[in-house]
Interface confidence: medium
């Protein structure tokens, strides 16, 4: 079975310590290389990935991860218990929800067994690496004769989320963007109603609950109006510029080790 | 006037490179994904390689993978194409082209031969 | 890959002959298939998009169907112009491919 785990790329967000520690020795040796960095992603506060490079090891090494949670009730060391490999090394960790502690500054270890002393700590604060799933169930309705409300769901995290809707015309070559509070509802006051319009929306895990900067993926479209994409050029862009970035999303494959919680995967 | 003009082709010895650039006028160009796609004599249509509207994703045809790269200047409205270890078979007219083929231009020959 | 197979590679017709290309895909493509001409020495024109969409600015004597993994470029009544190679390209799936033509030459 082979299983996507898609994880974005940077952290910028999270803040960061590392501790090395190497032996004392006159030639360089394997522990005083430096560990990859570990990148973690809560996903809609259902699961999260903490991923890294193994790629950058100077030989296959099944690195292995230990957490806890800084100053709290949860401070006790615990092992990672769901690896994610990589061509059959470990690059991953998934953590299930209930391992997920928000508010708590998460602490996170990467070791290499093999040299107990090659390693690194990171913490981080869990509640700017959140990435809620995209908006679903997009709906429009007229208000007036020229007036469009847009309304969305987000799973679990409504109150948590800004939101950005983007919206053209079949005509537009470009989005036009409006930012959203909370509220996940926006309004177009003026509509030509001789055009067709396309929405979407993605969501973002800040700034009510956490200071977020990934957004999650964009909504599947919607539209309003009477063109289809057969008969304008832009949104059979559009469509086939979508299938390209799904391609893209897909490039670095990560495998599941087990198939428990399948239905978490990051959904696009 | 939306268009595309190439330039950069010409005569290399096989091992060489050369770098073709596409220049855009007439609509906004960030907002297209390029791609490129080459024609050898006599025979049919290839695509070579795409890029995002950023510039941050390319993908590349196993025919020049490793090879060619391409990216892109938004500011200057402007597309490369670098090739490097060119063969004999990458003797072709290359042309740049907005994404789905609705704006081409009107081709380079690149010629590799000793 | 996707393999696009054209049939046939080589026609003859006159002028005002009804014309049909086919463009095969060894998997389905959806309607993520467009059409091109070209003439001796010229970049291709894009003809087609979404398999049976008419480019703005193409002649209503050609046409296009299908979907999945059968599609067919129609021209209605040939015109002294038409003359030239036709391909198809399908960008459901990277990377993208080329049929490999259709020429269209005067009986």
């Known amino acids: 079975l082979n299983t996507t785990i898609l994880t974005p790329n940077g952290n910028e967000d999270a803040t960061t310590d590392f501790f090395l520690t190497s032996m004392p020795t006159d030639s360089l040796s394997v522990s005083t290389l430096p560990l990859p960095e570990v990148q973690c992603f809560v996903f809609n506060v259902e699961y999260m990935n903490c991923t890294w490079n193994s790629s950058s090891e100077p030989q296959p090494t099944n690195l292995t991860l230990h957490y806890w949670y800084k100053n709290s009730d949860n401070d006790k060391v615990q092992k990672c218990s769901h690896y994610l490999f990589s061509e059959e090394i470990t690059s991953g960790c998934q953590l299930q929800k209930k391992e997920i502690h928000l508010y708590q500054t998460f602490v996170v270890q990467l070791q290499d067994p093999r040299e107990p002393r090659r390693q690194a700590t990171q913490m981080l604060k869990l509640q700017n690496l959140v990435i809620p799933w995209a908006p679903e169930n997009l709906t429009l309705r007229k208000l007036s004769e020229s007036q469009l409300e847009l309304n969305w769901n987000n799973r679990f995290l409504n109150h948590c989320l800004e939101h950005l809707v983007q919206y053209r015309t079949d005509w537009d070559h470009s989005w036009t963007e409006q930012s959203v509070d909370y509220r996940h509802k926006f309004s177009l006051p003026s509509v030509d109603g001789q055009k067709r319009y396309t929405f979407r929306v993605r969501s973002r895990f800040n700034p009510l609950c956490g200071s977020a900067q990934h957004w999650s993926e964009w909504s599947h479209p919607i539209h309003w109006g009477s063109n289809s994409s057969k008969e304008n050029p832009f949104l059979f862009a559009l469509e086939a510029e979508q299938k390209l970035i799904s391609e893209e999303d897909l490039g670095g494959e990560q495998k599941l080790i087990s198939e428990e919680d399948l239905h978490h995967h990051h959904h696009h | 006037q939306v268009q595309l003009v190439e330039s950069g082709g010409g005569l290399v010895k096989p091992g060489g490179s050369l770098r073709l650039s596409c220049e855009a006028s007439?609509?906004?160009?960030?907002?297209?994904?390029m791609t490129w796609i080459r024609q050898a004599p006599g025979k049919g249509l290839e695509w070579i390689a795409y890029?995002?509207?950023?510039?941050?994703?390319?993908r590349y045809a196993d025919s020049v993978k490793g090879r060619f790269s391409t990216s892109r200047d938004n500011a200057k409205n402007s597309l490369s194409l670098q090739m490097n270890s060119l063969r004999a078979e990458d003797t072709a007219v290359y042309y740049c082209?907005?994404?789905?083929?609705?704006?081409w231009g009107q081709g380079t020959l690149v010629t590799v031969s000793s | 890959d996707i393999q696009l197979t054209q049939s046939p590679s080589f026609l003859s017709a006159s002028v005002g002959d009804r014309v049909t290309i086919t463009c095969w895909a060894s998997?389905?493509?959806?309607?993520?298939l467009v059409w091109y001409q070209q003439k001796p020495g010229k970049a291709p024109n894009l003809l087609i998009y979404?398999?049976?969409a008419l480019q703005s600015g193409v002649p209503s004597r050609f046409s296009g169907s299908g979907s999945g993994t059968e599609f067919t470029l129609t021209i209605s009544s040939l015109q002294p112009e038409d003359f030239a190679s036709y391909y198809c390209?399908?960008?459901?799936?990277?990377?993208?491919?080329f049929g490999q033509g259709t020429k269209v030459e005067i009986k």
């Open positions: 007439g609509f906004t160009f960030n907002d297209f994904y």
């Open positions: 979404a398999a049976s």
């Open positions: 998997q389905d493509i959806s309607s993520f």
């Open positions: 390209e399908q960008l459901n799936n990277y990377p993208w491919t």
């Open positions: 082209a907005r994404f789905y083929g609705d704006i």
């Open positions: 890029i995002s509207k950023s510039g941050d994703k390319m």
